[in-house]
Structure formats: structure tokens, C-alpha cells
Interface confidence: medium
Amino acid sequence: SGRGEAETRECIYYNANWELERTNQSGLERCEGEQDKRLHCYASWRNSSGTIELVKKGCWLDDFNCYDRQECVATEENPQVYFCCCEGNFCNERFTHLPEAGGPEVTYEPPPTAPTLLT
């Protein structure tokens, strides 16, 4: 499988466990992968009684279920950790939960941050 039309080179990066894992807390991540593999961005978060707790954001390597998704939309009904993936630079900046059961769509807007580039 070659590159998709929306080629992903950079994603929003975030790590809630940045201190423990000795990484930056937030910024931009340059995506790198094998020549014939596609690249995606992802976001993962928890929802505790309506309070959104961002877990991680970043690059995500060649995943069939992320192909050709321009927006980051989680469809799992009520998981411990919500997850979405998408294709296109910084497509994981905004992320949405749209459960299959047809509940209300909830879109999460990121707070403005000063990005630092991760390589």
C-alpha cells in the first residue's frame, strides 16, 4: 500500500506521562516510517464524568482502520481510553467522539499552546 492522498508528515504531539517517560509534554512530531507504509496521526483521551483528560497524541504507523480518515473521530461506545486516528498533517489537533449508538457528537478543541518541534 502506497502513500494515501493526504500524506501525513507531522502530527500534534502530547504525552500526559511526559515526566515519567522523559519526553516533551507537547509540541509537534515529525512522522517517520518505512517507505511503503502509510503514516497517520492519533489522539487518545479519557472522559471522566464529562471531564476530558488527554492521554497521548502523536504519529501512528500504518493502520488499515485509519486509512483515508481526514478527521479524528472515535466511535467506541464507552471505552476506558478513547482513540481516534486520521491522515493529514496535524489532523489530530481536534478530536471527536461520535458513538455508533447515535449519541451526541462531542468535539474537543485544543487549548492554544506554543508548539515545540519533536524530531
Partner: antibody, heavy 118, light 112 residues
Framework: QLVESGGGLVRPGRSLTLSCTAS????????MHWVRQAPGKGLEWVSG????????AYADSVKGRFIISRDNAKNSLYLEMNSLRAEDTAVYYC?????????????WGQGTSVTVSS | DIVMTQTPVSSPVTLGQPASISCRSS???????????LSWIQQRPGQPPRLLIY???NRFSGVPDRFSGSGAGTDFTLKISRVEAEDVGVYYC?????????FGQGTKVEIK
């Protein structure tokens, strides 16, 4: 729920199209796969298709002979099998791709049997 | 492609006793995101396969807690703490993080 159909007895070199009808979930949110099982043998991944049909992948053993497709409006997955060989004899399962982050191959159909014999 | 090898091929077990199945991959299954996408699939006689365990050790919905998965890197294990009659069947390990998905050759669990 996934229900396969279209299997049967077919002569070598002929064609057959398998269908899979999905219910109980939003079909067009998921990539889908075909996995087969020859009599008395293990599981073999055959082909996969992305949610919007833009990306398709095939096992080397069927590349150039089989075509995977889907119709999201009909909640249906298809496998067009051409130039069939005796070694294509198997039960063919339609399988939902629950997503790598979550479960992987999480919903399986009952399977449809294909026998290639003269 | 990744090759998955299971041992033993067959495992005769006494009811109520434990059973253990090993799976080894030809290369590390640790993904760049830190997760390992190794699943275990059960196939009872005459039935279609069904997902038991995902991401090494997570039980899928409805799977009894006598089933557990462990391992890392290239070596993985499925354990049944106390085998019941309904556990008879073939168990497959599967690598599902990339296409082509690859399966182990299967381990048959049968009652002695």
C-alpha cells in the same frame, strides 16, 4: 453480526462471488477482512478493505485473482474469486477489523464453504 | 511477513487442570506506539473463530477470567487456569497490527 453467503461447489478455473451482510454496528466505520480455513487446516488471512474502499490488500496466494469490494449503503462486503484452484477450497469468514488500538479482528461470521473440484 | 509459531501442536488436558500454549513471532511485535498487537483466537469444534484476548493480555467481552495472556516482544503465552469441557478446540495466536495479518498454526486443546 456478520452473515456470509455465496459459497458452493465450483470447477477449477471458474469464478465465484462471496457476500457478507453486516448488522448491529455502523458498517462504514470499520475496515473489513476475509479470512479462510482449508479443511483440517489453520486460519489464513486473504484480503482486507478500508472503510471507504480506497485501500485494498491481498495475500500473495490470491493476488491478481481475487477482488475485495464493499457497498456501505447495503452494509455488504464481497469477495470476487476468479481462476479458482483446488487450494482455494476452504471455509471463508467475513471479519470485522475492530481497530488496532482496540481489539483487532473482533467480530467473525459463521463462514461460507467453497469447494473447488472437477 | 511475520511468521507465528505455536507450541505444542496438541495439548491433552485433564478437566479442572491448567493448560498453557506458547506463541513465538519471527520478529518483535512491539509497535512504535509501545503496544503489542498480539491476539488469541479460540475456535470450538464446528464453530467459527472468536476473539479471546487482545493486546497480549486483555480479555475480550464475555471471555471468562480463567483465560489469561502474557508475554512481550516475541514470546507470548495463553493460559487456561482450570480447563472446562467448553474450552475444547483450537487456539490461534494472531498478529494484527499490519496487513497481511498472520496466524499461528493453531494448538488443539482436548480432554484426556
Amino acid at each position: 453480526q456478520l452473515v456470509e453467503s455465496g459459497g458452493g461447489l465450483v470447477r477449477p478455473g471458474r469464478s465465484l462471488t462471496l457476500s457478507c451482510t453486516a448488522s448491529g454496528f455502523t458498517f462504514n466505520d470499520y475496515a473489513m477482512h476475509w479470512v479462510r480455513q482449508a479443511p483440517g487446516k489453520g486460519l489464513e488471512w486473504v484480503s482486507g478493505i478500508s472503510w471507504n474502499t480506497n485501500s485494498k490488500a491481498y495475500a500473495d496466494s490470491v493476488k491478481g485473482r481475487f477482488i475485495i469490494s464493499r457497498d456501505n449503503a447495503k452494509n455488504s462486503l464481497y469477495l470476487e474469486m476468479n481462476s479458482l484452484r483446488a487450494e482455494d477450497t476452504a471455509v471463508y469468514y467475513c471479519v470485522r477489523d475492530g481497530g488496532r488500538f482496540y481489539y483487532g479482528l473482533d467480530v467473525w461470521g459463521q463462514g461460507t464453504s467453497v469447494t473447488v473440484s472437477s | 511477513d511475520i511468521v507465528m509459531t505455536q507450541t505444542p501442536v496438541s495439548s491433552p488436558v485433564t478437566l479442572g487442570q491448567p493448560a498453557s500454549i506458547s506463541c513465538r513471532s519471527s520478529q518483535s511485535l512491539i509497535h512504535s506506539d509501545g503496544n503489542t498487537y498480539l491476539s488469541w483466537i479460540q475456535q470450538r469444534p464446528g464453530q467459527p473463530p472468536r476473539l479471546l484476548i487482545y493486546k497480549i493480555s486483555n480479555r475480550f467481552s464475555g471471555v471468562p477470567d480463567r483465560f489469561s495472556g502474557s508475554g512481550a516482544g516475541t514470546d507470548f503465552t495463553l493460559k487456561i487456569s482450570r480447563v472446562e469441557a467448553e474450552d475444547v478446540g483450537v487456539y490461534y495466536c494472531a498478529e494484527t497490527s499490519q496487513v497481511p495479518h498472520t496466524f499461528g498454526q493453531g494448538t488443539k486443546v482436548e480432554i484426556k
